[in-house]
């Protein structure tokens, strides 16, 4: 059954808490992703910039998260018209905005 | 191109140890992950393990005590051992590519022959 | 881990005709609302080759005719109609949990 809006993005946020807390050499190996307009679609968007990181398994659960909250497919490569215009960040630093954001949805309940 | 390729010694004693090494060109081992997957003659296809782009490690359960899987990233080289092997062991040896999220094993190498036999 | 069973061991379809091969997991191989199954065609000395991944999405440069579909434990490749180059073993493989898993094949024979 689907994960109620609530739940997902408790799940999300609490994920991203635990890639943070725990992180020790460069996460991902320094990988840069598109930086994304987190102001709508936020679970697609994310996934659309994060699916382009390969054989990174701290972020694995992430992606699949993203991807079961996203209701359209999503592939690698996909341009993203969510995407801030040619402005790559390190990975670390996606996630750390990207649940800033998060939280601040989750503060405001807007789950969906 | 994105090309794996695995090497191997062939033939092996009873008991031995075996070495494996995957070469692979046109992308690189630091942002992919490479598996470990073998064949018996006539059988059927057995994952042994993986590495992640990030170093992580993931075995196989069954062989776990017995399997250790690093790699020269630098170098483009992932390497398979195996320890006190058995004619049972014998098989071809393939090393597999991940590709982008969901981590279907999307490239392979044609593999290599080892025969475990005194 | 996960245990994969595949049936029929072997099938003989005719040209032009369908072929089903089914897969059972042990346990749901079902991720927030995805199925992390994918299959994989290999023919007589060569590599396995994959076909679908996530259940039911066609590999880039595989023919329409093959298709995946199922969800949790139980899970269907389709090919029709069938082609003699489809003569091959395929197998269904699991990435839900750290340690994947395989199953044991299905053998196709074109009459």
């Known amino acids: 059954s689907p994960v109620p809006p609530s739940t997902a993005l408790k799940e999300l946020i609490e994920e991203l808490v635990n890639i943070t807390q725990n992180q020790k050499a460069p996460l991902c190996n320094g990988s840069m992703v598109w930086s994304i307009n987190l102001t709508a679609g936020v679970y697609c968007a994310a996934l659309e910039s994060l699916i382009n990181v390969s054989g990174c398994s701290a972020i694995e659960k992430t992606q699949r998260m993203l991807n079961g909250f996203c209701p359209h497919k999503v592939s690698a490569g996909q341009f993203s018209s969510l995407r801030v215009r040619d402005t790559k960040i390190e990975v670390a630093q996606f996630v750390k905005d990207l649940l800033v954001h998060l939280k601040k949805l989750f503060r405001e309940g807007q789950f969906n | 191109e994105v090309q794996l390729k695995e090497s191997g010694p062939g033939l092996v004693a009873p008991g031995g140890s075996l070495s494996i090494t995957c070469t692979v060109s046109?992308?690189?081992?630091?942002?992919?992950?490479i598996n470990w997957v073998r064949q018996p003659p006539g059988k059927g296809l057995e994952w042994l393990g993986m590495?992640?782009?990030?170093?992580?490690?993931d075995y196989a359960d069954a062989l776990k005590s017995r399997l250790s899987i690093s790699k020269d990233s630098s170098k483009s080289q992932v390497f398979l051992e195996m320890t006190s092997l058995r004619t049972d062991d014998t098989a071809t040896y393939y090393c597999?590519?991940?590709?982008?999220?969901?981590?279907?094993?999307?490239?392979w190498g044609q593999g290599t022959s080892v025969t475990v036999s005194s | 881990d996960i245990v994969l069973t595949q049936s029929p061991a072997s099938l003989a379809v005719s040209l032009g005709q369908r072929a089903t091969i089914s897969c059972r997991a042990s346990?749901?191989?079902?991720?927030?609302?995805?199925?992390?199954m994918h299959w994989y065609q290999q023919k007589a000395g060569q590599p396995p080759k994959l076909l679908i991944y996530?259940?039911?999405n066609l590999e880039s440069g595989v023919p329409a005719r093959f298709s995946g579909s199922g969800s949790r434990t139980d899970f269907t490749l389709t090919i029709d109609p069938v082609q003699a180059e489809d003569a091959a073993t395929y197998y269904c493989?699991?990435?839900?949990?750290?340690?994947?898993?395989f199953g044991g094949g299905t053998k196709l024979e074109i009459k």
């Open positions: 493989q699991q990435n839900a949990e750290d340690s994947r898993t």
């Open positions: 996530l259940a039911s």
């Open positions: 590495i992640w782009g990030d170093g992580r490690i």
């Open positions: 597999a590519r991940d590709g982008y999220f969901p981590y279907a094993m999307d490239f």
């Open positions: 346990e749901s191989v079902d991720s927030y609302g995805q199925s992390y």
């Open positions: 046109g992308f690189s081992l630091t942002d992919s992950s």
